[in-house]
Structures are given as structure tokens and as C-alpha cells.
């Protein structure tokens, strides 16, 4: 999905008001000092990309954080203004469905949502330039 | 103006079960979560679960696991719930309201007018 | 999963007097993530405040929200007949979403 056409603007909104707390929540009990941020975005459109990708695609020793509240949150700013994005998840949910149980918060889940805090703040500062 | 229609009342046995459906107009159907919420005579609210029409994702409360059914049917923007093995526990109104952020809070907005089910043999 | 405990479940107002509802939550919540709705008999829930403080839209500015962490309430500042009905707190922050058991608000 491109997320050119994205209302950035009330993503950002969203993020601030609701996202990141629940980011926030799901970290609790975590140094902000344990992990080093590995993944970088250089705009907008590419920060959501990866936002994407880290909060929806199970990695090897993360396959849970789709059942997370932030996720939830963070699908429905996406369809709601991403237009045409709801209409590109027909296989991508469903594909995982079976291998997804919430509740099991590994080492490797936090650092995860390490990494997507970053990418979050990166996208609330896009004129920033690229580190 | 957005709407949520839900079907209308059911009188089912017990040991049955029952499909009822609510029906969405004026957004975009699939880019929205749709809850269901159940309330029994006289008592509060109980979170059910919720559907993701997109892509058919969808989250359950543990204890209607089993009980409770979510689907979605994008063609004719219409959320269904399932309830089965019905009981007397099960009579109730149930309703489903749009997920969406209302001034960057998610929260439901737009609920349907409910719908009653009561079981009884 | 999280508790959330209203009270008081029943109460009653005279016109003009102020009103506060309590919604008591079993762990720390927050306060972007808990909502109140209203309802009353035989229809569907109104969502009246969302993120602990703000107002729906066509909620009268009487109302108003406030609160954090664990502690969170509702408060009319001159009841009118209009605003008796059943207040429901609700919390976003996880799963399952609960709800707290409701205050019934008459009016005297």
C-alpha cells in the first residue's frame, strides 16, 4: 500500500491522543534506555510503511502484537485516513490469524515496540533531517 | 448520515441458535470496527467483541468464546453475530456501535437500535 | 481484565443540585482510554464523554469529565430532568473493554 495520500495530519492526531499511550503501556516496567532504535523512516509515508510492517507482520519471536490494543488503534487510524487502505487488508489479517495469541509479551515483543515508539516519533517530526 | 440497522426481535429455543445482523450506510463500511455489546433485562453493559470488515480480524472477550460469532460481509455492508447452544442466560439486547476516533479518542460513536433475543421453550 | 466500579449505582437529584458519578478502576489507566455514555430506558447508549474530559457533540457544557490513573468521574453542575438516565464508564486500555456497572440518576 502507498501511503502518499494519507491524512498525516490526523494520523498524528490520533497518535499523540490515544497510540501512544498504549505504546506506553505495553512498555511499562522498561527502561527507555534497554534498546537501541535499529529501524529508521525517512518520511511520512515511509514511516507508516514500516509502522505497518513492525505492528502487523509476526517476526521470529514476536508473532502477537496484531491482538494488541495498540494495533487495533493503529489499523483503524490507517483505514479511516489511508484512503483505499482497508480495501488492500483482505489476505494480510487473515494469513497470520491462526499463529496469533495475545498475552505473551517476549523480550523480543518489547523490543519491537521499542523500535515502533521510534518510528512514531520520527513520523510526528518530518521535517527533521534523517539521522 | 451514518446509520446502524439491526434486525429485528427473536423468540429462539433453548439449545439453538440465532444469526442476527446489523447494517451499516453512509461511510466506508470496511474501514471501521464494529463492536457488539450485550445487555440483559434490567442490567448494565457486557463487551462481546469486535469485527475488522477489511479483513475479517476480529477480538473476542473470552467469556463469549465459543458462544459469540463475528462476520462481516462487505458486499452488503452487514456485520453478523452467531449465538449459539442458546441458553436463558443468553436472553438479551444486543447491540452493535462503530470503533472510530472522535476528536483523536477511539471510542464507538453510532450504535444500532438493538436487538432483542429471548429464549424460551 | 480491568474493573471498573460506578457508584452510586442509584441516585437522585433535585433540580439545580450538582451531581458527581464515580467509575473506580482496578488498574491504572489512561485517562485518553476511559469514556462515559449515557442511556436511557429502551434505547441504545449515547457516547457522552470521551478521553475522561471532553464532550460529545450535543452534550450540554453542565457536564464535564475528570480524573486519572485509577479514579475517574462524571459531573452535573445543575441537574435538570433532562439529564435523568443511566451513566455507563468504559475503559480502551485493554482487552476485554469492560464497563462499569452503571449509576442510575433520577430526578427528585
Known amino acids: 500500500y502507498d501511503f502518499t495520500n494519507c491524512d498525516f495530519e490526523k494520523i498524528k492526531a490520533a497518535y499523540l491522543s490515544t497510540i501512544s499511550k498504549d505504546l506506553i503501556t505495553y512498555m511499562s516496567g522498561t527502561k527507555s534506555t534497554e534498546f537501541n532504535n535499529t529501524v529508521s523512516c525517512s518520511n511520512r509515508p515511509h514511516c507508516l510503511t514500516e509502522i505497518q510492517s513492525l505492528t502487523f507482520n509476526p517476526t521470529a519471536g514476536c508473532a502477537s502484537l496484531a491482538k494488541e490494543m495498540f494495533a487495533m488503534k493503529t489499523k483503524a487510524a490507517l483505514a479511516i485516513w489511508c484512503p483505499g487502505y482497508s480495501e488492500t487488508q483482505i489476505n494480510a489479517t487473515q494469513a497470520m490469524k491462526k499463529r496469533r495469541k495475545r498475552k505473551v509479551t517476549t523480550n523480543k515483543c518489547l523490543e519491537q515496540v521499542s523500535q515502533l515508539q521510534g518510528l512514531w516519533r520520527r513520523f510526528n517530526r518530518p521535517l527533521l533531517k534523517q539521522q | 448520515q451514518v446509520q446502524l440497522q439491526q434486525s429485528g426481535a427473536e423468540l429462539v429455543r433453548p439449545g439453538s441458535s440465532v444469526k442476527i445482523s446489523c447494517k451499516a450506510s453512509g461511510y466506508t463500511f470496511s474501514s471501521y470496527w464494529v463492536n457488539w455489546v450485550k445487555q440483559r433485562p434490567g442490567q448494565g453493559l457486557e463487551w462481546i467483541g469486535q469485527i475488522y470488515p477489511g479483513d475479517g480480524d476480529t477480538d473476542y472477550n473470552g467469556k463469549f468464546k465459543g458462544k459469540a460469532t463475528l462476520t462481516a460481509d462487505k458486499s452488503s455492508s452487514t456485520a453478523y453475530m452467531q449465538l449459539s447452544s442458546l441458553t436463558s442466560e443468553d436472553s438479551a439486547v444486543y447491540f452493535c456501535?462503530?470503533?472510530?476516533?472522535?476528536?483523536?479518542?477511539?471510542?464507538?460513536?453510532?450504535w444500532g437500535q438493538g436487538t432483542s433475543v429471548t429464549v424460551s421453550s | 481484565e480491568i474493573v471498573l466500579t460506578q457508584s452510586p449505582a442509584l441516585m437522585a437529584a433535585s433540580p439545580g443540585e450538582k451531581v458527581t458519578i464515580t467509575c473506580s478502576v482496578s488498574?491504572?489507566?489512561?485517562?485518553?482510554?476511559l469514556h462515559w455514555y449515557q442511556q436511557k430506558s429502551e434505547t441504545s447508549p449515547k457516547p457522552w464523554i470521551y478521553?475522561?474530559?471532553n464532550l460529545a457533540s450535543g452534550v450540554p457544557v453542565r457536564f464535564s469529565g475528570s480524573g486519572s490513573g485509577t479514579s475517574y468521574s462524571l459531573t452535573i453542575s445543575s441537574m435538570e430532568a433532562e439529564d435523568a438516565a443511566t451513566y455507563y464508564c468504559?475503559?480502551?486500555?485493554?482487552?476485554?473493554?469492560?464497563f462499569g456497572g452503571g449509576t442510575k440518576l433520577e430526578i427528585k
Open positions: 488498574s491504572s489507566i489512561s485517562s485518553s482510554n
Open positions: 468504559q475503559q480502551w486500555s485493554s482487552y476485554p473493554l469492560t
Open positions: 478521553g475522561t474530559s
Open positions: 456501535a462503530r470503533g472510530t476516533y472522535y476528536n483523536n479518542y477511539y471510542g464507538t460513536d453510532y
